[in-house]
């Protein structure tokens, strides 16, 4: 969490950003809030990116002003216009790319004063793994697949029966580059599993951590999955 204070004569306002991650090939949100103002026409929101000449986005007098917008952000940015009056200056970014990573500044002017805060935006790829029984194998194996990760993650397996035990000697993980030559498909096979046990496949990089659980019994298969972004620090 980054909290910035602006000084305009004696007047400053608090601006708060949340360090966040963008999943490439999806829309992303760069989070920024500020002390609300009662008059929309008095609010100016400017988003800037370190190393970029033009603006990322500008909203003033109750509407977008894209006259000074940098070429790389044309057609890709939006604020939540109906929420600005309530202090939401968050930016929506269409079709996040690796190159969108960097340091952004959310700069706010209201009738109360000025303020700004920086935001570290990380970009990568992350997806929820699916764990299945590998019926093609001669032994009881589990296959964990996740379609899109970047940067290359680490994969570990764990089981409920062996709390804290990792399976470094009995699983094999491969990474296959996807067609766009950036993200990779993750496949990990855990060998010789036992029935009536819960196994977890955990995939993690510096952006996200995802877990796929499976419990195989004689009568049924239960699955559960979870995805968590790792870098949601506020500023």
């Amino acid at each position: 969490l980054i909290i910035g204070f602006g000084i305009s004569g004696r007047h400053s306002i608090t601006v708060t950003t949340l360090t966040s991650a963008g999943n490439i090939g999806e829309d992303g949100i760069l989070s920024c809030t500020f002390e609300p103002d009662i008059k929309l026409s008095d609010i100016v929101i400017q988003w800037l990116k370190e190393g970029v000449m033009g603006l990322v986005h500008e909203f003033k007098e109750g509407k977008d002003d894209l006259s000074d917008q940098d070429e790389m952000f044309r057609g890709r940015t939006a604020v939540f216009a109906d929420q600005v009056i309530g202090g939401n200056a968050s930016l929506r970014l269409k079709n996040v790319q690796l190159t969108d990573a960097g340091t952004y500044k959310c700069y706010i002017i209201t009738s109360k004063g000025k303020g700004n805060a920086n935001l570290e935006y990380k970009t990568g790829a992350f997806s929820i793994p699916e764990v299945n029984v590998d019926y093609n194998a001669s032994s009881e194996n589990l296959r964990c697949e996740a379609p899109r990760w970047f940067p290359q993650p680490t994969v570990v397996w764990a089981s409920q029966a062996d709390q804290g035990a990792n399976f470094s000697e009995v699983f094999n993980t491969s990474f296959e580059l996807n067609s766009e030559n950036v993200t990779m498909k993750v496949v990990s096979v855990l060998y010789n599993v036992t029935i009536n046990n819960t196994y977890s496949c955990m995939i993690e990089n510096d952006i996200a951590k995802a877990t796929g659980d499976i419990k195989v019994t004689d009568s049924e298969i239960k699955r559960r999955s979870h995805l968590q972004l790792l870098n949601s620090k506020a500023s």
Epitope: G25, E26, K63, R74, G75, A78, K94, S179
Partner: antibody
Framework: EVQLVESGGGLIQPGGSLRLSCAAS????????MNWVRQAPGKGLEWVSV???????YYADSVKGRVTISRDNSKNTLYLQMNSLRAEDTAVYYC?????????WGQGTTVTVSS | EIVLTQSPGTLSLSPGERATLSCRAS???????LAWYQQKPGQAPRLLIY???SRATGIPDRFSGSGSGTDFTLTISRLEPEDFAVYYC??????????FGQGTKLEIK
């Protein structure tokens, strides 16, 4: 050259199924937001579906549950699987790439639903 | 659901004249996500304007876009014979994910 070429249209009976294809060249389908847009005879443009670079999909309410958008990354091809077809699905179907907007369109393929 | 309403439905003008086409949204639309397309009979649509005011590659400078919030305008400063077509505005980013206006037909007077 950046290009999209649709195929798979034709005359189909109500309740039938059809799979439309859209072959892309000059760019990678999986790096872009790829759309299907249709146009009924003498009518305006209607958005049908989108698949994001990530693989996430969205559909218009008018087709939800009846159509599935997908892609084959190895063939650089977009698909639209259409089931339970109705007379009101009769249209020219276009695929379109969306970068900052829908900047590349195919020539369209005609789907006619009639008994 | 955001509804885009284009006016007029049909616009009759002569070559050399100025055309002003309007697109009104039922609620606020981000300027970045507003685009204009041209479609001629038997052809696929062609992108003219994106981000409300940026011309797409290869589009002549007689085409310009403006507006923000709920009101957007496409202006053709001096009509050429090849400009007579149907024009659509389109927004991205709300549910449904994309919406088109019903179109304005620009015909020769």
């Amino acid at each position: 050259e950046v290009q999209l070429v649709e195929s798979g249209g034709g005359l189909i009976q109500p309740g039938g199924s059809l799979r439309l294809s859209c072959a892309a060249s000059g760019f990678t389908v999986s790096s872009n937001y790829m759309n299907w847009v249709r146009q009924a005879p003498g009518k305006g443009l209607e958005w049908v579906s989108v698949i994001y670079g990530s693989g996430r999909t969205y559909y218009a309410d008018s087709v939800k549950g009846r159509v599935t958008i997908s892609r084959d990354n190895s063939k650089n091809t977009l698909y639209l699987q259409m089931n339970s077809l109705r007379a009101e699905d009769t249209a020219v179907y276009y695929c379109a790439r969306d970068t900052y907007a829908m900047d590349v369109w195919g020539q369209g393929t005609t789907v006619t639903v009639s008994s | 659901e955001i509804v885009l309403t284009q006016s007029p439905g049909t616009l009759s003008l002569s070559p050399g004249e100025r055309a002003t086409l309007s697109c009104r949204a039922s609620q606020s639309v981000s300027s970045s996500y507003l685009a204009w397309y041209q479609q001629k009979p038997g052809q696929a649509p062609r992108l003219l304007i994106y981000g409300a005011s940026s011309r797409a590659t290869g589009i002549p400078d007689r085409f310009s876009g403006s507006g923000s919030g709920t009101d957007f305008t496409l202006t053709i400063s001096r009509l050429e014979p090849e400009d007579f077509a149907v024009y659509y505005c389109q927004q991205y980013g709300s549910s449904p994910m994309y919406t088109f206006g019903q179109g304005t037909k620009l015909e020769i007077k």
